[in-house]
Interface confidence: medium
């Protein structure tokens, strides 16, 4: 689809091409399985163009179909971690608020590995907040080439 001259003058945000790529800031306190994210040019190769961060969680500002992707590498890891440390380590990405739209979008288990990565297309609405929950006892790496999370607006 070709853009009109008027459209070409508009910033990407106004065209609906919302996009974000985040890096891990920190894990939550003991009873909080959420991963807390950060983004911005001062932090390296992370950015937010449209979506915003709310207390470390990604909030969507434009309705549409999005590609959601995530990679998490465990910093403290072992091929026998799942058996030795009782609770299998699982990563889940979902809409956590508003409560009326709460749903799991991605669920992955580390099993015998130290890195998981996945992506999917899914409809998201303005105000949806995405949470990434890491359950189990293992710690994620904060290295920016090993753990990252992002969304890309694809179409209305």
């Amino acid at each position: 689809q070709r853009l009109s001259r008027a459209q070409q003058q508009l910033p990407l945000e106004s065209l609906g091409w919302d996009i974000a790529e985040l890096q891990l800031n920190h894990t939550g306190p003991q009873q909080d399985p959420r991963l807390y994210w950060q983004g911005g040019p001062a932090l390296g190769r992370s950015f937010l163009r449209g979506p915003e961060l709310d207390k470390g969680q990604l909030r969507i500002r434009r309705d549409g179909i999005y590609m959601v992707h995530i990679q998490v590498t465990l910093a403290i890891c072992s091929s026998t971690s799942t058996s030795r440390h009782h609770h299998p380590t699982t990563l889940a990405v979902g809409i956590c608020s508003p409560a009326s739209r709460s749903i799991s979008l991605l669920r992955l288990s580390f099993h015998q590995g130290c890195t998981i990565a996945s992506q999917r297309l899914t409809p998201l609405a303005r105000g949806d907040t995405l949470c990434t929950n890491l359950t189990g006892t293992l710690l994620p790496s904060r290295n920016t080439d090993e753990t990252f999370f992002g969304v890309q607006w694809v179409r209305p």
Epitope: H26, Q30, I76, C77, T137, S141, N143
Partner: antibody, heavy 120, light 108 residues
């Protein structure tokens, strides 16, 4: 300046208990995972236990699992190691060590150590 | 458990000489998560190298690390009097974290 100061070592009989403490300063204690590493006289370094910044995740070497408990009090900037059912082979200098910012388990700062001697 | 074997056990050299220390792992170290530490008598270990080749803050550039997979090397390009100590490698890619038993660099 990062400082780690261990205390609580001493002599104890086999089967006894000791509680080691590590007072931390010079960094935001609750943001960093911490470990205990030990070194028997003239021997290699051996990792003992680790704990996440929040205290919610703990890890142990097989040799101490079920006998030692690592914990932390972030309000006091202090790391602990409760050692029960002590054995002669637990005799060592015990170091507390700070993990680096990425949660990677290499140790960027170490304390000077406290000696634990288990002997009858 | 990943076993780290350091060699030689002792290295006798003179100040100004080059020191090459080896650390061999029993299986591949994930993402080259290998560190080197220096320890002097009665002191705590001090971090020199992490990620197999990255120098820690404040470490002189005469210290360098290299290697991948199962074979790693610490090189001290020109030994200074303060470099005579015991050097340990440590892998942090897998639980339990393990150390080598050290290489002692002594004055010849």
């Amino acid at each position: 300046e990062v400082q780690l100061l261990e205390s609580g070592g001493g002599m104890v009989q086999p089967g006894g208990s000791l509680r080691l403490s590590c007072a931390a300063s010079g960094f935001t204690f609750s943001s960093y995972a911490m470990s205990w590493v030990r070194q028997a006289p003239g021997k290699c370094l051996e990792w003992v236990s680790a704990i996440s910044g929040s205290g919610g995740r703990t890890f142990y070497a097989e040799s101490v699992e079920g006998r030692f408990t690592i914990s932390r009090d972030n309000s006091k900037n202090t790391l602990y190691l409760q050692m029960n059912s002590l054995r002669a082979e637990d005799t060592a200098v015990y170091y507390c060590a700070k993990h680096d910012y990425s949660n990677y388990p290499y140790f960027d700062y170490w304390g000077q150590g406290t000696l634990v001697t288990v002997s009858s | 458990e990943i076993v780290l074997t350091q060699s030689p056990g002792t290295l006798s050299l003179s100040p100004g000489e080059r020191a090459t220390l080896s650390c061999r792992a029993s299986q591949s170290v994930r993402s080259n998560y290998l560190a080197w530490y220096q320890q002097k008598p009665g002191q705590a270990p001090r971090l020199l190298i992490y990620g197999a080749s990255s120098r820690a803050t404040g470490i002189p550039d005469r210290f360098s690390g290299s290697g991948s997979g199962t074979d790693f090397t610490l090189t001290i390009s020109r030994l200074e009097p303060e470099d005579f100590a015991v050097y340990y490698c440590q892998q942090y890619g897998d639980l339990p974290f393990t150390f080598g038993c050290g290489t002692k660099v002594e004055i010849k």
